[in-house]
């Protein structure tokens, strides 16, 4: 499911329960995706020892995965709500091609991989409603994404396993940073 249980807009809020605010919905959505990533990481970590490797050992890769930096305004120091929100949405849009790559990469967690992808699309929609400066958000070029996807899928098995691990770890870290920042907004 692309949204956590009870979060579908068709659901009628229980009489004793306030409907979730926009911020609460976003928070819950990110936690839901993180739970999904955790399940996917379990499968990849059981298959290889990459999860135990230090970041430095895995740093030599040609993936251009989105990453939070000080300049993005999402950290405690130099926090800037608008700049940060643009970075979060832009980063999630950039991750979409990598999430597409993850489809068919899992045997026992195929549905979970699809749920992470669909939930991320929903999260982007939630965040776009929150953002004031939508003009600053750059959407990735579909042609570039298509050729990147082809290139990733043409890698040998070991590189594909490495790519899968790196995408999950980077996406997890990006969402965690996003969650910390959004909780400050």
């Amino acid at each position: 499911a692309p949204v956590p249980p009870g979060e579908d807009s068709k659901d009628v809020a229980a009489p004793h329960r306030q409907p979730l605010t926009s911020s609460e919905r976003i928070d819950k959505q990110i936690r839901y995706i993180l739970d999904g990533i955790s399940a996917l990481r379990k499968e990849t970590c059981n298959k290889s020892n990459m999860c135990e490797s230090s970041k430095e050992a895995l740093a030599e890769n040609n993936l251009n995965l989105p990453k939070m930096a000080e300049k993005d305004g999402c950290f405690q120091s130099g926090f800037n709500e608008e700049t940060c929100l643009v970075k979060i949405i832009t980063g999630l849009l950039e991750f979409e091609v990598y999430l597409e790559y993850l489809q068919n990469r899992f045997e026992s967690s195929e549905e979970q991989a699809r749920a992470v992808q669909m939930s991320t699309k929903v999260l982007i929609q939630f965040l776009q409603k929150k953002a004031k400066n939508l003009d600053a958000i750059t959407t990735p070029d579909p042609t570039t994404n298509a050729s990147l996807l082809t290139k990733l899928q043409a890698q040998n098995q070991w590189l594909q396993d490495m790519t899968t691990h790196l995408i999950l770890r980077s996406f997890k870290e990006f969402l965690q940073s996003s969650l910390r920042a959004l909780r400050q907004m």
């Epitope: 993180l34 230090s54 970041k55 939070m68 950290f75 120091s77 870290e173 940073s177 909780r183």
Partner: antibody
Framework: EVQLVESGGGLVQPGGSLRLSCAAS????????VTWVRQAPGKGLEWVGI???????AYATWAIGRFTISRDNSKNTLYLQMNSLRAEDTAVYYC??????????????WGQGTLVTVSS | IQMTQSPSSLSASVGDRVTITCQAS??????LSWYQQKPGKAPKLLIY???TLASGVPSRFSGSGSGTDFTLTISSLQPDDFATYYC????????????FGGGTKVEIK
């Protein structure tokens, strides 16, 4: 063996500086959230700051500007740089690791602590 | 976010049921942990996510709560349980003075 070992504590004069180290063994420090917590003699636990897997840091309001957390991945060591020290900074300083790194911070691997005494 | 723990100390006997409460100044979902600390030792994680027992922790310890109000319960106090207990919020570590509650010292009656 998976463990954290703090060092660098000692006696320092008010206004002075000190750098504490937290050496990790049995795991790669860069994969985890790691925090510093302190405890003044006879007092409760006080959170100092944290470094996340992405090298993002956060600090308690009172520590901002005086304390800095950094990490040397090649040495698998975490640091706490403390400047402009005051008598009230006297405490045992612990480093601790978050074991699951989901999203909420919780710490289940702790070092033995190192005592910092600020006195003239 | 501020964490308020009560009581600050309590006296109890072996076999007693002991309850410690922790209140957050705003909602922290279930992102709360409990620690046990003995004199001269580092704290030990007992419970995380409000109710999940950490590895190796006896089942007489349990946690409950969500939002702002949380409870740590020791169903039948054992000699090894006399210690100080702390709650800690892991929801947000920005713009806070302390992530921990003030502590509760459990003493022998």
């Amino acid at each position: 063996e998976v463990q954290l070992v703090e060092s660098g504590g000692g006696l320092v004069q008010p206004g002075g500086s000190l750098r504490l180290s937290c050496a990790a063994s049995g795991f790669s420090l860069s994969n985890y959230y790691v925090t510093w917590v302190r405890q003044a003699p006879g007092k409760g636990l006080e959170w100092v700051g944290i470094i996340y897997g992405s090298d993002e840091t956060a600090y308690a309001t009172w520590a901002i500007g005086r304390f800095t957390i950094s990490r040397d991945n090649s040495k698998n060591t975490l640091y706490l740089q403390m400047n402009s020290l005051r008598a009230e900074d006297t405490a045992v300083y612990y480093c601790a690791r978050d074991d699951s790194s989901d999203w909420d911070a919780k710490f289940n691997l702790w070092g033995q602590g190192t005592l910092v005494t600020v006195s003239s | 976010i501020q964490m308020t723990q009560s009581p600050s100390s309590l006296s109890a006997s072996v076999g007693d049921r002991v309850t410690i409460t922790c209140q957050a100044s705003q909602s922290i979902n279930n992102e709360l942990s409990w620690y046990q600390q003995k004199p001269g030792k580092a704290p030990k994680l007992l419970i995380y996510r409000a109710s999940t027992l950490a590895s190796g922790v006896p089942s007489r310890f349990s946690g409950s709560g969500s939002g702002t109000d949380f409870t740590l319960t020791i169903s039948s106090l054992q000699p090894d349980d006399f210690a100080t207990y702390y709650c800690q919020q892991g929801y947000s570590l920005r713009n806070i003075d302390n992530a921990f509650g003030g502590g509760t010292k459990v003493e022998i009656k």
